[in-house]
């Protein structure tokens, strides 16, 4: 089939103890080969404090998958989801508020 | 755009203190992104120093460590480079520029400023 | 730290001709790497970032490709305003480290 880009989306969970798990959710996006990774302060964030979810069939002949990090709340600036899909690059923030939600579809 | 210009003396004697500013224009050094200072040596070689972030958190590359200071200036929107107990080997051209949390690549850098380090 | 090691250190060559300069990481930096252009006397500036993607107003005879630890900048017909010297420089983690340079001088 021909290449399908990612829906891209950044959410924050509740606050807990200064801290909040920013999530990075990739969606409808063919093939199933994807980069998905948190970046902070513009490098790589280090393995062992990201958590990746499978890269799952949505049921559209398409794919999703997710990861995640916990960050302190009040420097959600200083990160980045960086998306690679089939050629396509894209940087995603964390939206400043836990009530916004960021989406990104990449042409 | 974002406009920086480096200023500070071109010539410090060794084992002195080495202090230069950056002044930036077009963009708040609060609102966001990480403030850099990088140098560059006669021959060419490139090494990044450090930053100051749009809070004040600092980075500094740990060859430099127990000799470099980034500073800021928050009113005049200035940042600033302090080198203490220089020697011929901090001869440099030296920069600042800035990277978006993005990626730590770097967009645009001031002109430089040569520095010598001689007695 | 990523030491980064480019070559050639210098290259001759004529207007019209292709020319390619690569930069090997001591480690996989997973495509965090850029490229700069630097004419004699000036500042360096950005041509390429995420090891792939040509920053605003670059030339599209500019093209640089790679991964893991291998990445190499192409430049087609060159052009008189081409001359220089290029860097790499990594983005994986700190300390943020650059190639020692590839001078690009006419033939």
């Known amino acids: 089939g021909s290449t399908v880009p990612p829906m891209v989306n950044v959410t924050c969970s509740e606050v807990s103890e200064g801290n909040i798990t920013v999530t990075c959710r990739a969606s409808s996006f063919y093939p199933r080969n994807i980069t998905l990774t948190w970046r902070q302060d513009g490098v790589s964030l280090s393995h062992n404090t990201q958590q990746w979810g499978d890269v799952l069939p949505d049921g559209n002949g398409t794919y999703q998958t997710w990861v995640a990090t916990r960050i302190r709340q009040g420097e959600e600036q200083r990160f980045t989801c960086y998306m690679e899909h089939s050629g396509n690059h894209g940087t995603h923030p964390v939206p400043s508020g836990n009530s916004h939600h960021h989406h990104h579809h990449h042409h | 755009d974002v406009q920086l210009q480096e200023s500070g003396p071109g010539l410090v004697k060794p084992s002195q203190s080495l202090s230069l500013t950056c002044t930036v224009t077009g963009y708040s050094i609060t609102s966001d992104y990480a403030w850099n200072w990088i140098r560059q040596f006669p021959r060419n070689k490139l090494e990044w120093m450090g930053y100051i972030n749009y809070s004040g958190t600092t980075n500094y590359n740990p060859s430099l460590k127990s000799r470099i200071s980034i500073t800021r200036d928050t009113s005049k929107n200035q940042f600033f480079l302090q080198l203490i107990s220089v020697t011929t080997e901090d001869t440099a051209t030296y920069y600042c520029?800035?990277?978006?949390?993005?990626?730590?690549?770097?967009?645009?850098w001031g002109q430089g400023t040569l520095v010598t380090v001689s007695a | 730290d990523i030491q980064m090691t480019q070559s050639p250190a210098s290259l001759s060559a004529s207007v019209g001709e292709t020319v390619t300069i690569t930069c090997r990481a001591s480690g996989n930096i997973h495509n965090y790497l850029a490229w700069y252009q630097q004419k004699q006397g000036k500042s360096p500036q950005l041509l390429v970032y995420n090891a792939i993607m040509l920053a605003d107003g670059v030339p599209s005879r500019f093209s640089a490709s790679g991964s893991g630890t291998q990445y190499s900048l192409k430049i087609n017909s060159l052009q008189p305003e081409d001359f220089g010297s290029y860097y790499c420089?990594?983005?994986?983690?700190?300390?943020?480290?650059f190639g020692a340079g590839t001078k690009v001088e006419i033939k």
């Open positions: 520029s800035y990277y978006r949390y993005d990626g730590a690549w770097f967009p645009y």
């Open positions: 420089q990594h983005f994986w983690s700190f300390p943020l480290t």
